[in-house]
């Protein structure tokens, strides 16, 4: 494939990467599900500067983010390192919450109202931001 | 790497007290919900408490409600079992456990006899 | 308190032959479900989280399936090191509760 060089419509870019803000709600798998058919993955926050650019477009509206620990360890759908990156929970969380009577705890994060982070049920069909690197190479076979 | 280390076990008279600590390492441990699970000899798994990360969740088992205390100090990086009124059936090994058990102590042994 | 039952209590098996372990649950826990692995002397392992999910670094011989009030755990091709014994737990209501294990020994 060749490298990516410029967003694909209606994504936007941003410090070498490109990203794409849903309008409607999905549940987190599902929305994981989607970043990846697109060739991208859900967001995936790094740095403070990353986290003000996701929340400004996304407004005070809940959104996932790739980031989960269904599996035990927290984790990023990147692969980026959880316990040396950038973290930005609201106060009091990660709960895991079992409260909620939808069985199970909370496993999925997901950006607030305020933009700070919160466990959620992965079920809940909240908004979602897919993120692609500009300089990884595209799937696509180079035009000949 | 994750690293659980209890200590704090030992023998005790019924009624006693015991305070168990578990010291952890190498993960976020605030980001984590913690656990205490104990197995008495020769039988299987049972759990005893949780506690969220910032402790605004706390659960008991039944048979320990209102003789045990759950707690942790997310600056020390560490989780606490506070054991009042023992009785004889409390003998066990207790064990740490991060969050479903991905992570696990190498066990504390608590023995309450007269 | 949802209640695990977990069959047979003991399986004997020869190694390279495949294991089959079974958990059911009083009422349905969805996908809530994990496995661990206990030797004598040694904390438990999870192996299986989500009722399908392998745990880090976990061998692909482990795999488990299921969902709601019926699970299994099969190991395929035994090797000597997983001769243990095996516990189901759920994780779908308070309190979380474990099933009683099944011991895989040596035949």
């Known amino acids: 494939g060749s490298e990516r060089t410029c967003c694909p419509v209606n994504w936007v870019e941003h410090e070498r990467s490109c990203y794409w803000f849903s309008r409607s709600g999905k549940a987190w798998a599902d929305a994981d599900n989607y970043c990846r058919l697109e060739d991208a993955h859900l967001v995936v926050v790094t740095s403070w500067e990353e986290q003000k650019f996701v929340q400004h477009h996304i407004g005070p509206v809940n959104t996932w983010m790739g980031l989960h620990d269904q599996n035990g360890p927290w984790k990023w759908v990147d692969g980026t390192d959880y316990e040396t990156g950038f973290k930005n929970w609201r106060p009091e969380q990660p709960d895991d919450w079992y409260g909620h009577g939808l069985g199970g705890g909370e496993d999925c994060a997901h950006f607030t109202d305020d933009g700070r982070w919160n466990d959620d049920v992965c079920q809940r069909p909240y908004r979602w931001v897919c993120e692609t690197e500009l300089d990884k190479a595209s799937q696509e076979p180079p035009l000949l | 790497e994750v690293q659980l280390v209890e200590s704090g076990g030992g023998l005790v008279k019924p009624g006693g007290s015991l305070r168990l600590s578990c010291a952890a390492s190498g993960f976020t441990f605030s980001s984590y919900t913690m656990n205490w699970v104990r197995q008495a000899p020769g039988k299987g798994l049972d759990w005893v408490s949780s506690i969220s990360g910032s402790s605004s969740y706390i659960y008991y088992a039944d048979s320990v409600k209102g003789r045990f205390t759950i707690s942790r100090d997310n600056a020390k990086n560490s989780l606490y079992l506070q054991m009042n009124s023992l009785r004889a059936e409390d003998t066990a090994v207790y064990y740490c456990?991060?969050?479903?058990?991905?992570?696990w102590g190498q066990g504390t042994l608590v023995t309450v006899s007269s | 308190e949802i209640v695990m039952t977990q069959s047979p209590a003991t399986l004997s098996v020869s190694p390279g032959e495949s294991a089959t372990l079974s958990c059911r649950a009083s009422q349905t826990v969805s996908s809530n479900l994990a496995w661990f692995q206990q030797k004598p002397g040694q904390a438990p392992r999870l192996l299986i989280n989500?009722?399908?999910t392998r745990a880090t670094g976990i061998p692909a011989r482990f795999s488990g399936s299921g969902s709601g009030t019926e699970f299994t755990l099969t190991i395929s091709s035994l090797q000597s090191e997983d001769f243990a014994v095996y516990f189901c737990q759920q994780y779908h209501d308070w309190p979380p509760t474990f099933g009683q294990g099944t011991k895989v020994e040596i035949k």
């Open positions: 456990a991060r969050d479903r058990g991905s992570g």
């Open positions: 989500g009722a399908s």
